[in-house]
Interface confidence: low
């Protein structure tokens, strides 16, 4: 099980002193990256028990393996469900603490109930402040059951749940009808997935026989030991004031674990620390009792004395839980409660024993979970013990489970079970990720999800050019940092793979899937300069540039022109995809805008140095088109045009421009200026007889405006060929030769 403990400080005279602390004993707990150990989370769970909103609670992290929640301002802040989440991947575990108000109408006789599948669970709510109304039972916040007030038995309301199944697990509450939910009795029911003493997918495996109130986990068969006990079967007591799977944590404060509630992963639940009991864990055990909640009885024999933290303390010459075993009986010594090996390794396991008569090599045997018995290959005999060494055949996954070392002499026998965890070396499920690339280096994230078991001890990155048969280059990297592969060839594909290892012999996993990463092209180094530019209209700009002459081929795929409109904070980019191009027409620009212009060479995705910038002012756009343009033939060489001034003029018109074109003709059109902007009529002279002409016009203020609609008209017949059209306005007879 995950080594995760949620401690609640139950000294409740002042809510502001109340705190919850979540402590993880896991390796690398809380480092914060998904693949290598997510952070510890500690929060109030308001999904089932909602309390009035108050100031936010304060979360303080003490290193990577401890987090504390403070900032409770009033007693109602404390009521409800709190949870701590820790562990990584499949081992991610939630530990739950349920807090009851000491002033509630109803109080639970026992908050946490752990029962086996098929058992009958009995939740008992003690009447603290009586009300003559129904008692409503809820399960996970939903109505479950109602009891009448006269159904109290000995001042308690009982909820019997026969034949419970795992889905029955959850938060139960008993509330007087229409009383505040904060006055409820809150319970936590944990239903193991198997019947008593069994575990595993089909509940076919036998639990190791957890001691001292430990609870057998229905998924992995491990004992979840009460606070203050350790070992595969919780057989060993910690020193007073210590807890955690290896007794590595110490209770805060001078009074040790007094006043603290300990919550551990399911199916254990919560209890006081070893040596303490009571609703606030402030009462020491009565004589003859010990352990978490003082639930255990010493029953010491042969002069043993009862210690409320550890149980029987045996006099010299005796051992055993109740000091019932004579030291003459052989005894397994210092056997580790848990061993870990990697798949397909062939480890050596040692088992030491003492006794009188002295154990010899043949009297010590090792039994695997499948019942296979291994005999030792050699034994080391010392004055105080015999150590048998066993060579284990190649390990398979089925070897995970409880192994047993057994010693038998004429003085009796002893055995010690220990857990063997066969771990699968990690194999990356994905290829490493390319973060950035340059022409001679790749920056790679080696952090990938993996199958198999952690923790990850080393990460190797293997790489070589694609389609190459040369040896792989390998670097060992820190899994939490990005890696830069250096001294690579430009514009080259590299095959890159990750290999993960876990601690111990044979911990190297298979290589992960390859990925192709390609280095970038060489950076273009030439700096262009702008030769010139000219405006071809209010929204069009033609730009030309040059490059310095250098020997060898040009390193570049094209040019990037950038126009920066500082007023609007907008950049326009124009890609010229030929490296031979030296001119470009930019269209669709904004009239009347001041642009900063530069050009740079690009190669692949890399940009070379930009040219020195130029500043270009586009003329503003002209006025709207003249309205209602009309043409009328006057003779065989004259046509009169009439129009109306444009509407919504931004300023005074400086002139009109008329465009004349022979209909269907191939030549360029002629433009004629009308320099008297107040006019609304003009005569175009010098036209050819019997010829159809097209006319349109536009106004100019600072820049030329939009063209009007085009009109058609034919001159009258039988005239002579004219020299070319000229214009005469109605106010003045002067013409303009074109």
């Amino acid at each position: 099980a995950v080594d995760l403990t949620l401690l609640a400080n139950l000294r409740l005279t002042d809510p502001q002193r109340f705190f919850l602390t979540c402590v993880s004993g896991e390796a690398g707990a809380g480092r914060g990256s998904d693949a290598w150990g997510p952070p510890l989370l500690l929060e109030k769970d308001d999904r089932i028990v909602r309390t009035p909103p108050g100031p936010p609670l304060r979360l303080a992290r003490n290193g990577s393996h401890q987090v504390t929640l403070r900032g409770f301002s009033k007693p109602s802040d404390l009521v409800g469900v709190f949870s701590c989440v820790g562990g990584a991947g499949a081992r991610r575990t939630r530990v739950i603490y349920v807090h009851n108000s000491p002033g509630a109408h109803l109080l639970p006789d026992k908050v946490t109930h752990t029962v086996n599948k098929g058992d009958t669970a009995v939740l008992s709510a003690r009447v603290h402040k009586e009300k003559q109304t129904d008692v409503i039972w809820k399960s996970n916040g939903s109505y479950f059951y109602t009891l009448d007030w006269h159904e109290a038995q000995d001042g308690r309301f009982l909820l019997q749940l026969p034949n419970v199944q795992p889905p029955s697990s959850g938060i139960y509450s008993a509330t007087y009808l229409e009383a505040s939910p904060l006055g409820s009795a809150f319970f936590r029911l944990i239903v193991r997935g198997c019947g008593a003493g069994r575990w595993g997918p089909g509940c076919t495996k036998e639990c190791p026989g957890c001691l001292h109130g430990g609870v057998c986990h229905d998924h992995d068969g491990e004992c979840v030991c009460p606070p203050g006990f350790t070992g595969t079967r919780c057989e060993q007591a910690c020193r007073e004031g210590r807890f955690g799977q290896s007794c590595q944590e110490q209770c805060p404060g001078i009074s040790g674990c007094r006043g603290l509630t300990f919550c551990l992963p399911d199916p254990y639940g919560c209890s006081c620390g070893s040596g303490w009991r009571g609703s606030q864990c402030q009462e020491a055990c009565a004589p003859g009792h010990f352990g978490a909640d003082c639930r255990l009885q010493c029953q010491c024999q042969n002069g043993g004395t009862c210690d409320r933290f550890s149980g029987c303390v045996c006099p010299s010459g005796w051992h055993g839980v109740h000091c019932e075993k004579s030291d003459r009986i052989p005894q397994i010594l210092n056997m580790a409660s848990e061993l870990e090996f990697n798949l397909e390794t062939m480890p050596r396991i040692n088992c030491a024993a003492a006794g009188n008569p002295f154990p010899v090599r043949g009297s010590i045997e090792l039994r695997k979970p499948d019942g296979t018995v291994l005999l030792s290959t050699k034994a080391i005999v010392e004055p105080e013990k015999t150590t048998a060494e066993f060579e284990v055949p190649r390990l398979v996954l089925a070897d995970s489970g409880f192994w047993e070392c057994r010693v038998s002499t004429s003085g009796g026998q002893d055995s010690r079970r220990f857990k063997v965890n066969v771990k699968v070396p990690p194999v990356p499920l994905a290829a490493p990720r390319l973060l950035t690339k340059q022409s001679r280096q790749l920056v790679v994230s080696p952090l990938v999800s993996f199958s198999g078991d952690g923790p990850i001890s080393t990460v190797r990155l293997h790489y070589r050019p694609q389609d190459s048969t040369m040896d792989w280059s390998t670097i060992v990297v820190d899994p939490s940092e990005n890696v830069t592969l250096m001294n690579l060839r430009p514009k080259t594909g590299y095959s890159v793979r990750v290999q993960l290892s876990r601690p111990g012999e044979g911990g190297e996993g298979a290589w992960g899937p390859p990925t192709l990463m390609t280095t970038d092209c060489p950076e273009p180094l030439l700096q262009p300069w702008l030769e010139g530019w000219h405006v071809e209209g209010t929204d069009r700009l033609r730009v030309s540039w040059s490059l310095p002459l250098v020997p060898g081929p040009l390193v570049g795929d094209g040019f990037l022109l950038r126009l920066w409109d500082g007023t609007r904070g907008q950049e326009r980019r124009e890609n010229v995809s030929s490296p031979q191009a030296r001119t470009a027409l930019l269209t669709g620009l904004t009239p009347g805008t001041h642009y900063q212009l530069d050009v740079q060479l690009y190669h692949c995705t890399l940009l070379g140095p930009a040219s020195p910038p130029a500043h270009v002012l586009l003329p503003p756009s002209g006025p709207p088109a003249p309205r209602h343009l009309h043409a009328q033939a006057l003779s065989d060489s004259e046509i009169q045009l009439t129009w109306k001034h444009p509407e919504a003029l931004p300023g005074p018109i400086s002139k009109y421009v008329v465009e004349v074109q022979v209909a269907g003709g191939a030549g360029d059109p002629l433009w004629i200026d009308v320099d008297r902007p107040e006019e609304t009529s003009t005569i175009i002279r010098g036209l050819n007889a019997s010829t159809r002409y097209l006319f349109r016009m536009r106004a100019s203020i600072q820049g030329l405006g939009d063209w009007s609609n085009t009109v058609e008209e034919s001159t009258l017949g039988n005239g002579l060929q004219a020299e070319g059209p000229v214009q005469e306005s109605r106010a003045a007879e002067e013409g303009l030769d074109q």
């Epitope: 109505y143 479950f144 007030w149 159904e151 009982l158």
Partner: antibody
Framework: EVQLLESGGGLVQPGGSLRLSCAAS????????MYWVRQAPGKGLEWVSS????????NYADSVKGRFTISRDNSKNTLYLQMNSLRAEDMAVYYC????????????WGQGTMVTVSS | DIQMTQSPGTLSLSPGERATLSCRAS???????LAWYQQKPGLAPRLLIY???RRGTGIPDRFSGSGSGTDFTLTISRLEPEDFAVYYC??????????FGGGTKVEIK
């Protein structure tokens, strides 16, 4: 005198609606859980719905869930049953009843009102 | 749902005789949350017993209730003429719905 008096019954077509009322007197209405119980002609008793004192908690038999709505007006000492989408099998005498103390045993009953569902 | 089964369906007795009515639940009725009612033709039911054995207000002591778990009994020690009616049991201690038995008719022999 403690009394419950139902009204609002009558003839209605299948798919139609009716609203039953139950006027309470002689006790503190707002402190009691109230119930509707029905009895089809010649048949036994069937619990229909419950409403707790404040009106915040209501429960229904599966046969009426989603069609019937129980409510109460504590200021008027009145219990209601809104019946929609009525079916032939809803035809019965409808009684309102009071829960004894905090109990679901019914110590006071009204005289009943007949609901006939027929086309 | 908890089914309530009453027996016998009809009980033919004479005034002065002892009547024993049975009510059986399909599963345990918690803490004796069982009631008995009397109903006369054209009238509303009347609460006799609640909590399996407690008499309702104004109920004569010739009516008594007993039993627990799944088996309950209503006893009328000496039948009076006004006691001839239909009697229903009702469980109210389990998860909803509240359920009634089918009734026992006590008729004059």
């Amino acid at each position: 005198e403690v009394q419950l008096l139902e009204s609002g019954g009558g003839l209605v077509q299948p798919g139609g609606s009716l609203r039953l009322s139950c006027a309470a007197s002689g006790f503190t209405f707002s402190q009691y859980t109230m119930y509707w119980v029905r009895q089809a002609p010649g048949k036994g008793l069937e619990w229909v719905s419950s409403i707790y004192p404040s009106g915040g908690w209501t429960n229904y038999a599966d046969s009426v869930k989603g069609r019937f709505t129980i409510s109460r007006d504590n200021s008027k000492n009145t219990l209601y049953l809104q019946m929609n989408s009525l079916r032939a099998e809803d035809m019965a005498v409808y009684y309102c009843a009071r829960g004894r103390g905090g109990s679901k045993a019914f110590d006071i009953w009204g005289q009943g009102t007949m609901v006939t569902v027929s086309s | 749902d908890i089914q309530m089964t009453q027996s016998p369906g009809t009980l033919s007795l004479s005034p002065g005789e002892r009547a024993t009515l049975s009510c059986r639940a399909s599963q345990t009725v918690s803490s004796g949350s069982l009631a008995w009612y009397q109903q006369k033709p054209g009238l509303a039911p009347r609460l006799l017993i609640y909590g399996a054995s407690r008499r309702g207000t104004g109920i004569p002591d010739r009516f008594s209730g007993s039993g627990s778990g799944t088996d309950f009994t209503l006893t009328i020690s000496r039948l009076e003429p006004e006691d001839f009616a239909v009697y229903y049991c009702q469980q109210y201690g389990s998860t909803l719905p509240l359920t009634f038995g089918g009734g026992t008719k006590v008729e004059i022999k």
